[in-house]
């Protein structure tokens, strides 16, 4: 039975040109995390494999950095980066847990005036 839960940073916003850390945390389970996939819609951004380490998709190499931890850092943000991001935890023996983060990238002037998502 899958008892774990994924905690994420929820809905977040960031300035165009800036950077943001996407973080998920798996709790309430003793399952072993074998791999974490980071995806944007259906596009694979990066994989962190417990044995084989980090691998960043070639198309994101210039703008994505591994970490901290199992998280992912997105750099040089553009408005096109706005959207849903998923952390997919592959675990043994539980199976797969998925967390969702919604990122909105704002024009600098909008961000400076304090437009922010409320984290539920």
């Amino acid at each position: 039975m899958m008892t774990g839960t994924i905690e994420t940073t929820g809905n977040i916003s960031a300035e165009k040109g800036g950077s943001i850390i996407l973080q998920c945390h798996l709790s309430s389970t003793t399952a072993q995390v074998t791999q974490v996939n980071w995806e944007q819609q259906d596009q694979l951004l990066a994989i962190c494999n417990a044995d084989l380490g980090w691998h960043i998709s070639p198309s994101f190499k210039d703008r994505v950095a591994p970490g901290p931890g199992l998280g992912l850092t997105l750099q040089s943000l553009t408005v096109n980066d706005t959207g849903e991001y998923f952390c997919i935890y592959h675990t043994y023996p539980d199976g797969t847990y998925t967390g969702r983060i919604f990122l909105e990238v704002l024009e600098s002037s909008v961000a400076e005036h304090g437009a922010r998502f409320q984290i539920p």
Partner: nanobody, 117 residues
Framework: EVQLVESGGGLVQAGGSLRLSCAAS????????MGWFRQAPGKERELVST????????YYADSVKGRFTISADNAKNTVYLQMNSLKPEDTAVYYC??????????WGQGTQVTVSS
Amino acid sequence: EVQLVESGGGLVQAGGSLRLSCAASGSTFDTYVMGWFRQAPGKERELVSTISSDGDSTYYADSVKGRFTISADNAKNTVYLQMNSLKPEDTAVYYCAAGTRRGRNYWGQGTQVTVSS
């Protein structure tokens, strides 16, 4: 399922070279990385080197940098580990591994490398 078969191990004198091969078969379409690990008697398994499926990204453990080179022939579904300037401390069983997007790792049976002084 992905099947991995290693070859190329053997006995070599210190300073010599060996080239390990790892032939992959089966459902390799989902593989995003392949790599080599080694395990010496009484020691923990150590990641030696990895290469991404597109060959664009490689990793080397500090202990083998400048001596070992990983490469891939995608047409043959084979990954190679060229090992030069071998040292007695490189003696170990070398295992090939493949990582898949679905979070499953596959392992070969291993090939023995012995470096004599």
